[in-house]
């Protein structure tokens, strides 16, 4: 009956962690004697090719300084405990501790048997490192030029992580890769870039990081912060301002980052009705008169700049009863 070596074609282990390279001689055959088990690295330099051996009488040996006896062990193989007990070598699974990048490569598990001769199997050990991810907004000020508004960093992954962004904005990503502080790892940085405007401020975009060490992609939300001058509009005019009306109000509605530092109400005619009183973002009208037939201007200032809005007012002789009856306010 033919025997074969059962190994995994590929084994993945975490950098710094412990990995087992399974190796079994199958099937169990009465009278098949395993005289020696060896692990080799065929692609390594000549003096580092012999990784481990298990002699039924002498037990395990680990000759090469890399990985070395302090980082290697046979999981199940047992040597003969006395002259009357057989060694158990059918399971030659090798454990490798404190994985380094240099441990990556092909490993050959070989059983020297009698009378079948030598049989072997090969495993590719991949060393991976789980990256640490972070994403953050960059405080930017509006401009006409594309600017990085968010960063997503996947630190010290092996292989490098794949970063993408989920957003409805008009954007592009710029990626850089640098060596991590841990040998063999890579830190990936993705810059979310757009022309920063008020439309982007407060918008949440999502950084998506994919890596084979993750069960599912990491999704990191980032709320953008764009400093921009006030974007102003005026509300409260209902096209039903008439002489003598006493319940009218204009509101200066503002989107800005940072918050407004000042509001200024004026008219384009230069004449400001005495019955109109500015109270911050509101203009309270005590009584509408003919001077209100003008254009009101609200000018808002913040740390970045200023914005303004105009509202044309038409004063009627009498109330417009055909309207919805809305009252400004």
């Amino acid at each position: 009956q033919d025997v074969r070596v059962q190994v995994l074609p590929e084994v993945r282990g975490q950098l710094g962690g412990t990995v087992e390279l399974p190796c079994h001689l199958l099937p169990p055959v009465p009278g098949l004697y395993i005289s020696l088990v060896t692990w080799q690295r065929p692609d390594a330099p000549a003096n580092h090719q012999n990784v481990a051996a298990f002699h039924p009488k002498m037990g395990p040996s680990f000759p090469s300084p890399k990985p070395g006896s302090e980082r290697l062990s046979f999981v199940s193989a047992k040597q003969s405990t006395g002259q009357d007990t057989e060694a158990e070598l059918q399971d030659a699974t090798l454990a490798l501790h404190g994985l380094t990048v240099e441990d990556e490569g092909n490993y050959t598990c070989e059983f020297a048997t009698f009378p079948k001769g030598s049989v072997r199997g090969m495993t590719w050990l991949r060393v991976i490192a789980k990256p640490k991810n972070q994403a953050e907004a960059q405080k930017v000020t509006f401009s006409q030029d594309p600017t990085t508004v968010a960063l997503c960093i996947s630190k010290e992954g092996r292989p490098p992580a794949r970063i993408s962004w989920l957003s409805s904005l008009d954007w592009e990503a710029k990626e850089t890769q640098v060596s991590g502080t841990l040998a063999g790892t890579v830190t990936v940085t993705s810059r979310f870039t757009l022309v920063p405007s008020g439309r982007a401020d407060g918008v949440t975009v999502t950084c998506k990081v994919e890596h084979e060490s993750f069960e599912e992609p990491a999704l990191i939300p980032v709320t953008l912060s764009v400093r921009y001058p006030p974007e102003v509009s005026i509300s409260g005019y209902d096209d039903n301002w008439y002489l003598g009306r006493t319940d009218a109000t204009l509101s200066c509605d503002v989107r800005s980052n940072p918050e407004p530092t000042g509001y200024d109400w004026s008219t384009t005619s230069g004449t400001f009705p005495t019955s109109a009183v500015a109270q911050g973002s509101q203009l309270v009208i005590h009584a509408v008169d003919s001077l209100f037939n003008t254009t009101f201007v609200c000018t808002v200032t913040n740390a970045v700049g200023m914005g303004r809005a105009e509202q044309v007012i038409f004063v009627r002789e009498t109330p417009n009863t055909a309207g919805a009856g809305a009252t400004g306010g």
Epitope: A53, H55, Q83
Partner: antibody, heavy 116, light 107 residues
Framework: QVQLVQSGAEVKKPGSSVKVSCKAS????????IHWVRQPPGKGLEWIGA????????NYNQKFQGRVTITAVTSTSTAYMELSSLRSEDTAVYYC?????????WGQGTTVTVSS | DIVMTQSPSTLSASVGDRVSVTCKAS??????VVWYQQKPGQPPKTLIY???YRYSGVPDRFTGSGSGTDFTLTISSLQAEDLAEYFC?????????FGQGTKLEIK
Amino acid sequence: QVQLVQSGAEVKKPGSSVKVSCKASGYIFTSYWIHWVRQPPGKGLEWIGAVYPGNSDSNYNQKFQGRVTITAVTSTSTAYMELSSLRSEDTAVYYCTKLVGTFDYWGQGTTVTVSS
Amino acid sequence: DIVMTQSPSTLSASVGDRVSVTCKASQNVGINVVWYQQKPGQPPKTLIYSASYRYSGVPDRFTGSGSGTDFTLTISSLQAEDLAEYFCQQYNTNPFTFGQGTKLEIK
């Protein structure tokens, strides 16, 4: 401790047969192959064959196939190597040996002289 | 059968010398090679297994190297007690085969 004790020296005529014994002690006889290796005077080593006492399975070097029979008797923990149609070039020291990783345990050797 | 060709057949050296014995296999045997030492009137003793692994109790002046078809046994500093014959053996393929031996003499 493991011991392999072989029978004494033999002088044989060409064409005859010789049967050399090897009594084992100090381990489970049925669990290990017993091998036979010979060494002609002033020459190298030559593997003849082996027997597995656990099931009497045997395995031979093709060079000796048909002339050699290797057997084991579990009740006495003894292995035997019988070589027939002897010729002068069969003159050698015959060793029984136990394979534990390598040939780690050897009998003291039995000198077989084939001479007319 | 795999032929193990050993050289030299005789080697004469002085105490303290570094000496090497080579063994060439007629086909690839991986690292499945043993080196034995045999003193007159005694059976062989294992020095090296799996081409480069030193057997228990063997002085570290004995080292083995090689893989595939070319193997070397080196004694880094020859001692008087190393007077013996040295054999290589492959166990990669049945039948096991031995080199013809190297007789080491002390000058």
